[in-house]
Amino acid sequence: SAHAHPRDSCPLGPGRCCHLETVQATLEDLGWSDWVLSPRQLQLSMCVGECPHLYRSANTHAQIKARLHGLQPDKVPAPCCVPSSYTPVVLMHRTDSGVSLQTYDDLVARGCHCA
Amino acid sequence: SAHAHPRDSCPLGPGRCCHLETVQATLEDLGWSDWVLSPRQLQLSMCVGECPHLYRSANTHAQIKARLHGLQPDKVPAPCCVPSSYTPVVLMHRTDSGVSLQTYDDLVARGCHCA
């Protein structure tokens, strides 16, 4: 089929390929200190690392992209490491009428792939 | 809200920022000539270009990533240009029993954003 199995062993060495990494960030870092009340520090999982040929391909498009990048590196970029799923996070923030809780479904990455 | 409006004017100049571009590819280019029968040439729309700060942010996570990249460029990568949606493509391919048509929903990009 067009969708070969994604490669999961990193040919570049440990920690070099696309993976999830935790980044500590304060509300000040994010520019949110004026409206988010809690939590005051966030553990922001992010997708980092390289995407060598066919490593964790998101889908058929990513596989094609990887192949065409090999043929035309100046014209077609390599796939890059982006979230495949997210973990919801509840933030407490100020509103015009007081304080509110809101769930953000797209704030913290849960998994990564190469797209 | 945490999700500011995505910026759509490219500060780097025309054609430099994340956009959809059509790449012509033959079945030979893709390594599919042994099993795909038609179409024999594909118009593969791909996402190319840079993702300057907050340009076409996919979601809250991408905005955070952009901000943290500004603060810690060595630790947090910039968002990158990936498909936001896809156009289905029907391929005719050989099977053990003859010829089959199959729709691929994740082969050709239809829109792009910075994730």
Partner: antibody
Amino acid sequence: QVQLVQSGAEVKKPGSSVKVSCKASGGTFGGYAISWVRQAPGQGLEWMGGIIPPYATANYAQKFQGRVTITADESTSTAYMELSSLRSEDTAVYYCARGVGTTHLDVWGQGTMVTVSS
Amino acid sequence: DIVMTQSPLSLPVTPGEPASISCRSSQSLLHSNGYNYLDWYLQKPGQSPQLLIYLGSNRASGVPDRFSGSGSGTDFTLKISRVEAEDVGVYYCMQALQTPITFGGGTKVEIK
């Protein structure tokens, strides 16, 4: 079952243009290519051009190059064929058909009669 | 452009009897993948064309098994094993190997 429904008959003056539409009813183009084929009265079939996903760039028969424009709007599942600088020889029934690349034209529109007459 | 030539021009048939239509191309339609890029279409009176056979010998969905396609390279044949009254119309071969797609001139099948 997807059907291709074309716009109605047109009568045009020589030198003018005509734009024929082809809408996928009961579904979308679904990843199929769209070809345009015409048939002059009492004559055979003649391919004009086609467009494949993502419907960005069309491919035209040399005979019609510069006179025909084929486009498709995925959001409305509608394809268009515009033919300019019409002459009497363009009087024909114009069909749209879906296919896989250039082959397997398995669903055809009902045809649109275009008459070019002064 | 690839030129497609059909014969005969007209074919009077008797219901229940077999019928055969020939199609010849000016260059080979056999691709290196082993498939012949030739389709057959039937246009019944007052109707749009309909697909019968694709890639030389593959019957399209819903097409009765009395229709079969054969041949390779430049010579192709459409056979109807037992003609029925509903099979009348004009049959076209079409090459899909390269653009522009080209059709044969058509063979008119009518009941004797």
